[in-house]
Every structure is written in structure tokens, then in C-alpha cells.
Amino acid sequence: LCQGSNYSTCASCPSCPDRWMKYGNHCYYFSVEEKDWNSSLEFCLARDSHLLVITDNQEMSLLQVFLSEAFCWIGLRNNSGWRWEDGSPLNFSRISSNSFVQTCGAINKNGLQASSCEVPLHWVCKKCPFADQALF
């Protein structure tokens, strides 16, 4: 989580870069183009951010308002269990794989979906308004 100040009550909230959306204490980037999961991760890392790690059901519900039927990559992978890129387990929602190649996680307005990591999808990056703070 972002550290340092309570952005929701601060007098002048830190801003997000161009084409990023501020929501709560974080900045979110919703891609226009499509990439595979690894390329999406690289895109986010190159911008001092990370593929979206969702902390709870509330954040997931809020973000789904901005999503359509199209799936977007998030920072969720199945390595002997579904885990977020920050190492935490997925414990507030369900996702199931229909085949052994579905080891990456995506989200749309209806919920989470397992997918082959090779499929080109939109993606969502998340970061703090201050780049030198924690990414998750």
C-alpha cells in the first residue's frame, strides 16, 4: 500500500501522470492497446508501476465500474496457487482454470478470468502518486 500520507484527506493530493486515473490512494493506467501478460508487466515496470494488484473486494468492485466485457491483464498468476505479484494469495475472490495453460489472471466488469499468458489483452497498471513509494 502507499505510505506516507493519507491522500484522501490531504490538502493538496499528489497528482497522477498524464493518461493515468487517480482513484483513492493510487494511480491506475488502463491500456488502449493489447499485449501478452509478460509484455504488459514490462510496460508497467518501465513506468515505476506494476500490473494491477487488487487488495480487496471493495477495490475490485470500484475498478470494475471502469471495465467492459473485454478482459484486462492484472498482476495475478498461478504458481502452485493463485498469487498476486506482491506475493500475497488471492483470498477474496475465486478464479478457476479450465486448462493447464491458463496460468495468468485477467479481469473484466464481471470478474476474474484465468487465461493463457500469451493472449494479447488490454492491461491495468497501478502505482502510487509518488514513484519512490511502495508499488502495491
Epitope: F71, S97, N98, S99, F100, V101, Q102, A106, Q113, A114, S115, S116, E118, V119, P120
Partner: antibody, heavy 120, light 107 residues
Amino acid sequence: EVQLVESGGGLVKPGGSLRLSCAASGFTFSRYYMSWVRQAPGKGLEWVATISISGGNTYYPDSVKGRFTISRDNAKNTLYLQMSSLRAEDTAVYYCAREGGYGNLWFAYWGQGTLVTVSS
Amino acid sequence: DIQMTQSPSSLSASVGDRVTITCRASENIYSALAWYQQKPGKAPKFLIHNVKTLAEGVPSRFSGSGSGTDFTLTISSLQPEDFATYYCQYHYGIPFTFGQGTKLEIK
């Protein structure tokens, strides 16, 4: 409309080789895993090979491993099956099939099939 | 490898009948099961995935059920176009195995 059209089947002698092709249209070929499934005359269905979107991963049952090679050309929207060291038991109709999307590896769409006969 | 066994191998029924075809897996496959319909001289047609989810355009008289190792395909009221051979398939992992088929014939 999704269309898969196989070609390249025919009569080949035991030990011989053959290359099947599957021309895909009506969908974005480079977003989907693709497979080959065969059916011997009067018999059931048998999965033969599957290839990932990029072509970097291929999968085969033991019955064809080392003899058959699946490949794809995403620029040409075409799937291939190179078959070598053919045996009489490889005689079958060979179907090209597309997965359901996102790596859902059921066979959602099928071509009309091409017949391969291995006989001396 | 996981084996899929269908029963019966063949079945005679009449238009309007309710018909059930069974598929048994040699080990737990959870819900990774698909069903296909094939008519003579034609390619198979995809009917159902994940045990019970109907493919687009498949009539609602078709339904699937089961979990673990035992699965069924039910046709609630047979139509003339339903007489065909039906196959189940394990779709999670390698190898993707099919049942041997159940031929549904007109009585």
C-alpha cells in the same frame, strides 16, 4: 464466421511423410491455440497435437510424439502438421480445430477434415 | 493418463424420448469435461464445456451434469436431428482424451 479448411491429405506409403495445412479465416488466428484431432475409419476421436499462440509450445500424445510436428504461420493464418515415419494406424481423417479462447482447450470449431491413407 | 469411458456404446430411442449418456473418468477431473456431437461424414460439433455450459447456439434440450469422475449428457426430448454419435472429452491437461463414443440411433 469461423472457417477452418484442411488440405494436403492423400495416399502415402508406410514410412513416408506428408504435410497437412489448415487455412483459417473469420477470426484473429494469432489469438488462439490450435490443434489437430484425427479419426480412423469407423473409430472414435483422437487428439494429435496442440500449439500455443506464438508457436513456442507444442504438445503431443505418445502415439505421435517424435513423428509428427505441429507448426503455425500467424502471418498466413495457417496451421500445419508435418507427419513422418507414417504407419498404417495413422490412416484417418485429420481435423484442424480451434480452442474456445483464452487458452480454453476444448475444441470449439472444427474444419471439415482431410483424409490421410497410409498403405503400400 | 486419464481414460474416459462412455456408456452405453450404442442406444436406440424414439423422437420425444429423454436420453442420458454417461461418461466416466479414470480419476477426478473436477469439471474439465466437454461434449461433442458427430453425424456421419461430418466434423464433430462442440456442445458443452465445463460439464454443463452450453456452447453458443446449442438447444436448451441438451444439458450436462456431474463432477469428479461421473458425468452425464441428457437430451430432454429427442429431435430427429439429434440422432448422432456423442463424445465426451477431458479438456484440462495433456493428453486430451476422448471417450469412445455413444451412437444414438432411431428405434
